[in-house]
C-alpha cells in the first residue's frame, strides 16, 4: 500500500569497502524523494539523507560506531513537495534492506605495497596499513587495528626474469623473504580474512618491482 504517486524503493544493496559503506537502491526518483533510516537489531531507528533525490546514502558514520553489530536500513518514499503525505495505512511507503554486518561483510580494499628494502639476500616488503573511518578514542583505526590477527596478507613474488611465482604470508604488515643475489624481483600482495566465508579476499595490489623507486637496496 502507499500513495498513488510514489513507488517503493527496490534492489536495496550495501556497497562497502574498508568500512566506507553506502546503501544504494532503485529507482531513480520521478516526482518523489527518499529518506533512509538505519538501526541495529536492538536499537532505535536513525534517519539519514533526508528527502533526497539521490539513490544512495552514505551510512559510514553510523556503522563505524560498532562494526561488529548487524545493521538494517530502510528507504522511505515520499511525494516530492508533499513529504507529509503518507500511504493508506497512515505511513510512508518503505522497503527494508538486507541485514549487514560490517566486520563480516565489508569488502577488503585493494592493498598497496608501501616499500621494499633489500639487505643482502633478504627483502623486507611492507604493506601499507590503510586507515579506515572506524574510530576509537577519537583516532581513526587502521585495517590492522580493526581486524588484528584476523587479517592476513599473502605475498606473491617472482624473479623479473622468470614466470615461476612463490608465495609467503604474514599476519602483520611485513614480509621478510629470501631472494637470490643480483636478481630483480616483482611483488604483489592480497589481503585475506581467514574466518570469513564470503568477501574473504581483496583484489591483488598493483605489482611493484625492484629497480623501481619504491624500493631500496643495501649491500651488507
Amino acid at each position: 500500500s502507499g500513495t498513488t504517486n510514489t513507488v517503493a524503493a527496490y534492489n536495496l544493496t550495501w556497497k562497502s569497502t574498508n568500512f566506507k559503506t553506502i546503501l544504494e537502491w532503485e529507482p531513480k526518483p520521478v516526482n518523489q524523494v527518499y529518506t533512509v533510516q538505519i538501526s541495529t537489531k536492538s536499537g532505535d531507528w536513525k534517519s539519514k539523507c533526508f528527502y533526497t533525490t539521490d539513490t544512495e546514502c552514505d551510512l559510514t558514520d553510523e556503522i563505524v560506531k560498532d562494526v561488529k553489530q548487524t545493521y538494517l536500513a530502510r528507504v522511505f518514499s515520499y511525494p516530492a513537495g508533499n513529504v507529509e503525505s503518507t500511504g493508506s495505512a497512515g505511513e510512508p511507503l518503505y522497503e527494508n534492506s538486507p541485514e549487514f554486518t560490517p566486520y563480516l561483510e565489508t569488502n577488503l580494499g585493494q592493498p598497496t605495497i608501501q616499500s621494499f628494502e633489500q639487505v643482502g639476500t633478504k627483502v623486507n616488503v611492507t604493506v601499507e596499513d590503510e586507515r579506515t573511518l572506524v574510530r576509537r578514542n577519537n583516532t581513526f583505526l587502521s585495517l590492522r587495528d580493526v581486524f588484528g590477527k584476523d587479517l592476513i596478507y599473502t605475498l606473491y613474488y617472482w624473479k623479473s626474469s622468470s614466470s615461476g611465482k612463490k608465495t609467503a604470508k604474514t599476519n602483520t604488515n611485513e614480509f621478510l623473504i629470501d631472494v637470490d643475489k643480483g636478481e630483480n624481483y616483482c611483488f604483489s600482495v592480497q589481503a585475506v580474512i581467514p574466518s570469513r566465508t564470503v568477501n574473504r579476499k581483496s583484489t591483488d595490489s598493483p605489482v611493484e618491482c625492484m629497480g623501481q623507486e619504491k624500493g631500496e637496496f643495501r649491500e651488507i
Epitope: 599473502t154 612463490k166 608465495t167 604470508k169 592480497q190 585475506v192 581467514p194 574473504r200 579476499k201
Partner: antibody
C-alpha cells in the same frame, strides 16, 4: 555442506598425460586458495601447488613446475591438475584441499594414479 | 626452501601415555605450522593450526606448542582411536612442506 570430490585418476603409461578434476560443493572456490597434495603408497604427504581461482595465480613446488599445471573453472566450481610426461614415481593418491589461509580445512577423498607400462 | 624435520618417524606407546612429536624447521616459520592426523585410506584431518590453536571438534587431549623453528605436538593421554600417522605442515612460504610423518602404534 562443504565437499571436495576428485576424479580422473587411473592407470597411465609413462610419458603420457592425465587430467585430474576436483569438484567443489557447498562453497565457491574463488573465495579460497585451493591446493593439490599427493601421497605415494606408504609414503608421506607431498605438496604440489596452489591456485587462487579468482585471479588465476598459481604457485608450484619447483619439482613440479613445468610438468604439472593447476587450473580452475569457476563457473563449474572445479579445480584441475594437468599432469604431463608422467613417470612411475608419480604413482600416488592425489588430493585436493581447501585453504582458509591458516589451514587446509577440507580435503577430498583422493584419486589414485598409477603410472606403469 | 624450508625443510621440516619431524621426529620420531615411528612411536609405540600405551593407552593413557603422554605422547610427544617434534618438528624442526630449517628457518623461522612464524607459527605457520599445522598438525594433521591421517588414518589408512583416509584424507588427513586437521588437529592443530597456527602452532597452538585447537581445530573445531578436536579433543582437548591434543595440543601444540612452539614458535620460531621448533614445534611440538602432544597427546596428553593416548586413546586407542589415536592410532594413526601424524604430519606437520609449514605454510608460511612456498613451497609448503610436510614433515616426514610419525607413525603411532599402541603397545
Amino acid at each position: 555442506q562443504v565437499q571436495l570430490v576428485e576424479s580422473g585418476g587411473g592407470v597411465v603409461q609413462p610419458g603420457r598425460s592425465l587430467r585430474l578434476s576436483c569438484k567443489a560443493s557447498g562453497f565457491n572456490i574463488k573465495d579460497y586458495y585451493m591446493h593439490w597434495v599427493r601421497q605415494a603408497c606408504g609414503k608421506g604427504l607431498e605438496w604440489i601447488g596452489l591456485i587462487d581461482p579468482e585471479n588465476g595465480n598459481t604457485i608450484y613446488d619447483p619439482k613440479f613446475q613445468g610438468r604439472f599445471t593447476i587450473s580452475a573453472d569457476n563457473s563449474k566450481n572445479t579445480l584441475f591438475l594437468q599432469m604431463d610426461s608422467l613417470r612411475p614415481e608419480d604413482t600416488a593418491v592425489y588430493y585436493c584441499a581447501r585453504d582458509n589461509s591458516y589451514y587446509f580445512d577440507y580435503w577430498g577423498q583422493g584419486t589414485p594414479v598409477t603410472v606403469s607400462s | 626452501d624450508i625443510q621440516m624435520t619431524q621426529s620420531p618417524s615411528s612411536l609405540s606407546a600405551s593407552v593413557g601415555d603422554r605422547v610427544t612429536i617434534t618438528c624442526k624447521a630449517s628457518q623461522d616459520i612464524r607459527k605457520y605450522l599445522n598438525w594433521y592426523q591421517q588414518k589408512p585410506g583416509k584424507a588427513p584431518k586437521l588437529l592443530i593450526y597456527y602452532a597452538t590453536s585447537l581445530a573445531d571438534g578436536v579433543p582437548s587431549r591434543f595440543s601444540g606448542s612452539g614458535s620460531g623453528t621448533d614445534y611440538t605436538f602432544t597427546i596428553s593421554s593416548l586413546q586407542p582411536e589415536d592410532i594413526a600417522t601424524y604430519y606437520c605442515l609449514q605454510h608460511g612460504e612456498s613451497p609448503y612442506t610436510f614433515g616426514q610423518g610419525t607413525k603411532l602404534e599402541i603397545t
